[in-house]
């Protein structure tokens, strides 16, 4: 650890803390010798778990919380990148505070980057939640996008669709939503770059560039949608597929093409 004046981390997670925590659950008191009704685990404060992407400067402390309850009291364990996470997997270990359903990692370093999953379970059920940790330089850095967004969507013809792209960037990023298209039957232009259509971009006319909304979708709008984010340091992009299905025996609607700007665009997958 960086501080010789502070004790080494406990080798094993410890619940020996005096937290009087609103979030902690205690087993229901039994009355008349009857067993309490079984309850599968559930989140007690899901609103505190909404921030999934945590971009943290090196050396800082990270605290992930999964406040839960259930009957009997659920157990809590943590995975890193889908595998069992043991204290000796990182220098300085980590602390699990069972009273507050939290894991604490001090003095983070780049090797701490990854996905951290809490698993809360009892004999009646299991729930899990994943946080994404990125350890960043405070100085300007490339944009970082939350994993899993935008998400693939399958919707019925005529529905409205919303794609979301969560961005962490310093300096201010430029966000573009692109769709891969065909021009004269070809997806690739003469310059060997894919054809894309710019659907939306951050700027004066975009109220919320992190969200792309498509109204009354047609089959022609099926395909790959790309969230491309750039700043002067670099760029990042992630894509999702839209599948538009239509009921059988229904006449195919006329395809409306919007007069949006076409361009050649180099896109890294």
């Amino acid at each position: 650890r960086p501080s010789p004046t502070l004790p080494e981390q406990d080798a094993l997670p410890s619940s020996e803390d005096d937290d009087d925590d609103d979030d902690s659950s205690s087993e229901e008191k039994e009355t008349d010798n009857t067993k309490p009704n079984p309850v599968a685990p559930y989140w007690t404060s899901p609103e505190k778990m909404e921030k999934k992407l945590h971009a943290v400067p090196a050396a800082k402390t990270v605290k992930f919380k999964c406040p839960s309850s259930g009957t009997p009291n659920p157990t809590l364990r943590w995975l890193k990148n889908g595998k069992e996470f043991k204290p000796d997997h990182r220098i300085g270990g980590y602390k699990v505070r069972y009273a507050t359903w939290s894991i604490i990692m001090d003095s983070v370093v780049p090797s701490d980057k990854g996905n951290y999953t809490c698993i809360v379970e009892n004999e009646y059920g299991s729930i899990n939640h994943t946080y994404q940790l990125d350890v960043v330089e405070r100085s300007p850095h490339r944009p970082i996008l939350q994993a899993g967004l935008p998400a693939n969507k399958t919707v019925a013809l005529g529905s409205n669709v919303e794609f979301m792209c969560k961005v962490y960037s310093d300096p201010q990023p430029h966000i573009q939503w692109l769709k891969h298209i065909e021009v004269n039957g070809s997806k690739i232009g003469p310059d060997n770059l894919p054809y894309v259509q710019i659907l939306k971009h951050s700027g004066i006319n975009s109220s919320d560039a992190e969200v792309l909304t498509l109204f009354n979708v047609t089959e022609a709008q099926s395909g790959e949608y790309v969230c491309k984010v750039s700043n002067y340091i670099g760029e990042a992009n992630q894509s999702a597929w839209l599948t538009v299905t239509r009921p059988a025996l229904e006449e195919r609607p006329a395809v409306m093409t919007s007069p949006l700007y076409l361009e050649h665009h180099h896109h890294h997958h």
Partner: antibody
């Protein structure tokens, strides 16, 4: 045992620039820590000024950001604070400190008075 | 920016328990650290990461953090505990460090 020692003028004229240096001994400034400045006006509370990582990455208190510069000199194992356009309100004890998420080592502090 | 609110003063008789609070929006999601400062001296870390003690700090000092309030508890208070106490967090949203306004602990008698 890491030790920090502030040095610099104890008196600065209004509109001038306050300059302080913090010498780090017993440990490397290139460790996984942030090197911070905190001040305390007479009879008042602690105020975080800003900090620097050995890579040169910095973060500043928004209320002071336009006037503050923190720099690091790895060859001398020290870091420095410059605060421009000072007024009497900048009179305070200035501490340098080592930090991760918390401050685990502090200098003893140096009183800087802004007066003509 | 993030604000931490502490009571300006707390008084307690020797041998009793002192509780100093630190309020902040959803502070339970942050890691809270506590410092003791005696007149003319630099602050000293007494609790970090909500409830951990650095070596050399008596077990009488403990901490908790939940919801919108963190608490520093000093049991069996002694005259030597009289000092100013500050809470501090690194606000992960703004990426800035923040101190509470400080609480003066007075030991009566």
């Amino acid at each position: 045992q890491v030790q920090l020692q502030e040095s610099g003028p104890g008196l600065v004229k209004p509109s001038g620039t306050l300059s302080l240096t913090c010498a780090v001994s017993g440990g490397s400034i290139s460790s996984n820590n942030w090197w911070s400045w905190v001040r305390q006006p007479p009879g008042k509370g602690l105020e975080w000024i800003g900090e620097i990582y050995h890579s040169g990455s910095t973060s500043y208190n928004p209320s002071l950001k336009s006037r503050v510069t923190i720099s690091v000199d790895k060859s001398k194992n020290q870091f420095s604070l410059k605060l421009s356009s000072v007024t009497a309100a900048d009179t305070a004890v200035y501490y340098c400190a080592r930090a991760t998420d918390w401050f685990d080592h502090w200098g003893q502090g140096t009183l800087v008075t802004v007066s003509s | 920016s993030y604000v931490l609110t502490q009571p300006p003063s707390v008084s307690v008789a020797p041998g009793q328990t002192a509780r100093i609070t630190c309020g902040g929006n959803n502070i339970g999601s942050e890691s809270v650290h506590w410092y003791q400062q005696k007149p003319g001296q630099a602050p000293v870390l007494v609790v970090y990461d909500d409830s951990d003690r650095p070596s050399g700090i008596p077990e009488r000092f403990s901490g908790s953090n939940s919801g919108n309030t963190a608490t520093l508890t000093i049991s069996r208070v002694e005259a030597g505990d009289e000092a100013d106490y500050y809470c501090q967090v690194w606000d992960s949203t703004s990426d800035h460090r923040v101190f509470g306004g400080g609480t003066k602990l007075t030991v009566l008698g």
